[in-house]
């Protein structure tokens, strides 16, 4: 038995900031469990964790410099992910363990989701160029 | 046949660190089906759950151990390892590794166990 | 965590007695109809063996005389007759959450 994952296939980071939302066929209520987000169609990098458990709070961290946040609901985990760079625009998928009760369970792997990071426009306005030599 | 084999125990002092291996036979410590844990138990005591790992690489801890323990394995020579940080005299025990399925996580073999003592 | 207490903490029997050790956890450990409960024995200088998984299926290799029973908060685990080889302490663990806890044991002597 496989948990199945759904991801949106695409989203646009606009503000270097994005939501994203893995839905799994799977309650999650009462159980323990690790959530994690991946990036790159090898997965290599993982960008978030977000540990649940019946009994305590959400634990969120990355330990690959992301900023990331994560919020519960019974049948997903939403990833809050911010300071994103363009050069991060990638491709990343939903991961989930079930650890407690037994049987562990796992995901079967999802689509995965083009996140598109847009940057912040830098270049000065025509209307306050930037200073000029004498 | 399934095998799991303790070994690195022995004195320690108080402060130091320590790790154990545990080589596995018979099955895979990276394919799913079976995940591993370690235990120990004091002499004259009952048993205690240190910790686990799974097929994946994830890891679940004892919380009172948490902050000194870390549980890792080398999938090429098939082996869990066991680091234990800032040892103290209550830390003597023998340390076993133990296999479960993902069915029931009943712990179906064990090693043979290995001594550590910490004392100066 | 959930607490696991055993009864007696140990007891002196005779070849071909009826024992019976006690389990109580401080919460159930029942899951889908399944008892995440199971017993080991354990002989000095030994590893622990596993007898009964899952609160009273009979783990391969062990003999009949053993079996266990049970639901939520409550178990049992019976040697229908005592043999030579079965002095030993018994221990009770749950595998419904984390951290996976033991009872503190039920030493078997001989009277």
């Known amino acids: 038995n496989k948990i199945l994952v759904k991801q949106s296939p695409m989203l646009v980071a606009y503000d270097n900031a994005v939501n994203l939302s893995c839905k799994y066929s799977y309650n999650l209520f009462s159980r323990e469990f690790r959530a994690s987000l991946h990036k790159g169609l090898d997965s290599a990098v993982e960008v978030c964790v977000v540990y649940g458990n019946y009994s305590q709070q959400l634990q969120v961290y990355s330990k690959t410099g992301f900023n990331c946040d994560g919020k519960l609901g019974n049948e997903s985990v939403t990833f809050y992910l911010q300071n994103l760079y363009v050069n991060q625009t990638d491709i990343y998928f939903c991961k989930i363990e079930v650890m407690y009760p037994p049987p562990y369970l796992d995901n079967e792997k999802s689509n995965g989701t083009i996140i598109h990071v847009k940057g912040k426009h830098l270049c000065p306005s025509p209307l306050f160029p930037g200073p000029s030599k004498p | 046949e399934v095998q799991l084999v303790e070994s690195g125990g022995g004195l320690v002092q108080p402060g130091g660190s320590l790790r154990l291996s545990c080589a596995a036979s018979?099955?895979?410590?990276?394919?799913?089906?079976?995940?591993v844990s370690w235990i120990r138990q004091a002499p004259g005591k009952g048993l205690e759950w240190i910790g686990e790992?799974?097929?994946?690489?994830?890891?679940y801890y004892s919380p009172s151990l948490k902050s000194r323990v870390t549980i890792s394995r080398d999938n090429s020579k098939n082996t869990l390892y066991l680091q234990l940080n800032s040892l103290r005299a209550e830390d003597t025990a023998v340390y076993y590794c133990?296999?479960?399925?993902?069915?029931?996580?009943?712990?179906?073999?064990w090693g043979q166990g290995t001594l550590v003592t910490v004392s100066s | 965590d959930i607490q696991l207490t055993q009864s007696p903490s140990s007891l002196s029997a005779s070849v071909g007695d009826r024992v019976t050790i006690t389990c109580r956890a401080s919460?159930?450990?029942?899951?889908?109809?399944?008892?995440?409960l199971h017993w080991y024995q354990q002989k000095p200088g030994k590893a622990p063996k596993l007898l009964i998984y899952?609160?009273?299926s009979l783990q391969s290799g062990v003999p009949s005389r053993f079996s266990g029973s049970g639901s939520g908060t409550d178990f049992t685990l019976t040697i229908s007759s005592l043999q030579p080889e079965d002095f030993a302490t018994y221990y009770c663990?749950?595998?419904?959450?984390?951290?996976?806890?033991f009872g503190q044991g039920t030493k078997v002597e001989i009277k």
């Open positions: 133990a296999r479960y399925e993902y069915d029931y996580y009943d712990f179906d073999y």
């Open positions: 018979g099955f895979s410590l990276s394919t799913g089906g079976v995940g």
């Open positions: 790992i799974y097929h994946s690489g994830s890891t």
């Open positions: 919460q159930s450990v029942d899951f889908h109809g399944i008892s995440f």
């Open positions: 899952a609160a009273s």
């Open positions: 663990q749950q595998s419904y959450r984390s951290p996976r806890t």
